[in-house]
């Protein structure tokens, strides 16, 4: 069970607590201090602050999922006190919005509909840990007497009147309140002066829904329990001072009794169940450096071994309104360059022993994509690219282009916003793909702009392998190999043919094979072969070649 | 009247995909933390996804591991919409969706929920 309230009043948790719900925070609360941008743990010297009696809530909404206070009645147990308050940093949300438990699979709930009902049901005992989430309404009338808006009490139907007393002072029924639960069910409150004192309750009554809080000394390495009562008890062998029992070591279990002068024999017999040692868990960021744009992961570990059962500690976070009972948690769907703070907190048998603030600030996000202006060949071998920056934080950029399977990639300045490509190979298509990246947990590339141009036709490159044989006294047969770089769109390869300085032939063939025919017998030749590529003629292979005498 | 209705849900083979939504009526939806649960045969409940709220990040999302990279929840405040896209179905996740919603006066562990889908991934 969680803590419970004092005969006169609520009782808060020594520790900061987590903010779990929507409403402000109630006065009695003590709310987080501003966290580290590292991690906080709460040395646990904050000072208990309670309502006095003239404060006693007399009434409970049904439906607070935070303010969850109630009388103490004798035979009906007390509301437990919720160990997290509301609205403690800036980013719970505003009124009107509550968080939500996300934990994993519950395996003894039920998603159980009921006809005219849309809850999913909440049986005690169906729980997989005990809850102390404000987000779960004042606990159920089998178990704590709840009292609704403008007095209508929840309860059944009665045949006869109930009077039920809470307690409003340390005397013990001096002066009280009492509620009237009439048959239809509605309940008159009213206040008396009782003139004699009624006999003492026992001891054992008194106390036995007390909380502990206990407080962690960092150097000695002990506990300290502190007992959440308004009045000063006595424990059996002097073991308590100021309601406080000392030097208690973890994981052991140690036994007080509690006595006062308000109540009667038998003493409370107080098990204290101590919890580890707090430095032994360690609130560690488990963010992967690739997704730490985006996410957050968070996760306790156990540094050291201890004796305490596992099976109850229990542990809990809150991240704005999203609340998570888990021991590690990875939140996604982040702000890059933002900073996002988690509470979170460690139960041990449901009472809380210590918490730690963590302020992350996620990593910088992949830059935006970079707008290209234009992207143009300005001639043969070269062409210019020009851009307007990214919005976002990056650092260099990369310019790489493509022309058919070779890749050739650049390096650039942020500050650059146009570029001149250089050496570029006529009449080739580019495709230039420009992106910003940022080197930051890891080097993160922005999305890509692409463009492309083909660079200005040039002169092709000269036929190659070019051969002259004679296939008969006055023809010739001439080939050549096409050029290795064409430079432009079409492919026409040209012979000339030249005696002394006249030009006797001038053929123009798709493929580069020519047939001479009818050409002077015993004369010198020279054969000029060139490629024209529909812009510019290449340079021309030259070869000479001489007709022998006829044969006949 | 806090009102949720699941729709979407159908028979998928292994490796296929389905789209559940959630209309919302009855509360300011843009302001709560929305899930996902399911609850398989004989089974409890599992939350798979959950949206809310984180600093500046309205669409702060998180998953189960079972689901992590597979499902993705979003919301439509425009539509009081809730949606969970559902990639690589196994027949694991055969279970009912049901929408949750964590709304002032709902109880128990997952608050206010619809009628729930049925899902079945089966070849």
């Known amino acids: 069970q969680s803590p419970t309230p004092s005969p006169t009043g609520l009782t808060t948790a020594k520790m900061p607590s987590v903010p779990l719900s929507s409403d402000p925070l109630p006065t009695h609360t003590t709310a987080f201090s501003p966290a580290s941008t590292f991690e906080r743990e709460n040395d646990f010297s904050e000072t208990t602050t309670s309502l006095s009696p003239d404060n006693t809530s007399t009434q409970v909404s049904p439906d607070s999922l935070d303010n969850a206070s109630a009388f103490n009645t004798t035979g009906v147990s007390s509301v437990q006190t919720p160990h997290l308050p509301t609205h403690a940093d800036s980013q719970t949300p505003s009124a009107g919005t509550d968080t939500q438990t996300f934990s994993g699979s519950a395996a003894n709930a039920k998603l159980n509909p009921t006809p005219g009902s849309n809850a999913i049901s909440d049986v005690p005992g169906e729980r997989s840990t005990a809850s102390t989430f404000p987000t779960d309404p004042v606990s159920p009338l089998t178990t704590t007497l709840s009292l609704a808006h403008h007095s209508s009490a929840a309860l059944p139907a009665r045949t006869s009147n109930t009077t039920i007393t809470a307690n409003t002072s340390d005397a013990y029924l001096n002066a009280s309140e009492t509620t009237t639960l009439s048959p239809s069910g509605s309940a008159v409150i009213s206040t008396t002066t009782i003139a004699t004192t009624p006999s003492k309750p026992t001891c054992d009554e008194k106390y036995a829904n007390i909380t502990v809080d206990y407080l962690y000394n960092k150097e000695t390495k002990l506990f300290t329990a502190k007992l959440n009562v308004n009045e000063n008890v006595e424990c059996g062998n002097n073991t308590c001072t100021n309601n406080e029992v000392h030097n208690l070591t973890e994981c052991k279990n140690a036994s007080v009794s509690i006595s006062h002068n308000s109540c009667t024999a038998p003493d409370k017999t107080l098990i204290l169940d101590v919890p580890p040692g707090v430095e032994k868990f360690q609130l560690h960021d488990c963010t992967q450096v690739e997704k730490a744009d985006t996410t957050i992961c968070l996760k306790w570990k156990n540094i050291e071994t201890f004796t305490c059962d596992t099976q109850n500690i229990t542990y809990r976070f809150q991240c704005g309104n999203m609340i998570f009972d888990n021991k590690e948690i990875k939140l996604e769907n982040l702000e890059p360059e933002h900073e996002y703070k988690c509470d979170s907190e460690i139960l041990y048998n449901n009472h809380k022993f210590t918490n730690a603030s963590k302020i992350i600030k996620t990593d910088f996000g992949s830059p935006g994509e970079p707008q290209i202006i234009f992207c143009r060949s300005e001639a043969a071998h070269q062409g210019v690219i020009t851009w307007n920056p990214p919005q976002r934080s990056f650092h260099n950029f990369t310019l790489c282009y493509i022309k058919e399977t070779e890749k050739d990639c650049l390096n650039l300045d942020k500050n650059l916003i146009k570029y001149d490509l250089q050496n570029l190979k006529p009449y080739t298509k580019y495709v230039l793909s420009l992106h910003a990246y940022i080197i930051a947990k890891v080097q993160r590339n922005g999305s890509a702009a692409m463009c492309h141009f083909t660079t200005k036709s040039a002169p092709p490159s000269q036929v190659w392998n070019m051969t002259v044989s004679m296939t008969s006294d006055n023809s010739m047969h001439v080939k050549c190999r096409p050029p290795r770089d064409r430079n432009g769109p079409h492919e026409r390869y040209h012979l000339e043919v030249e005696a002394g300085n006249t030009l006797v032939r001038n053929e123009s063939h798709k493929n580069c094979d020519f047939r001479v025919k009818d050409l002077q017998y015993s004369t010198d030749y020279t054969f000029k072969a060139y490629f024209h590529n529909g812009d510019y003629p290449g340079e021309p292979f030259i070869l000479h070649h001489s007709t022998s005498y006829n044969s006949k | 009247e806090v009102q949720l209705e699941e729709s979407g849900g159908g028979l998928v083979q292994p490796g296929g995909s389905l789209r559940l939504s959630c209309a919302a009526s009855g509360f300011t939806f843009s302001n709560q933390v929305m899930s996902w649960v399911r609850q398989a045969p004989g089974k409890g409940p599992e939350r798979v996804a959950v949206i809310g709220s984180v600093g500046g990040a309205t669409g702060a999302t998180s998953y189960a591991d079972s689901v992590r990279g597979r499902f993705t929840i979003s919301r439509d405040n425009a539509r009081s919409t809730l949606h969970l896209q559902m990639n690589s179905l196994k027949p694991e996740d055969t279970a009912v969706y049901y929408c949750?919603?964590?709304?002032?006066?709902?109880?128990?562990?997952?608050?206010?929920w619809g009628q729930g889908t049925q899902v079945t991934v089966s070849s």
């Open positions: 949750a919603a964590r709304v002032r006066g709902s109880t128990g562990d997952f608050g206010s």
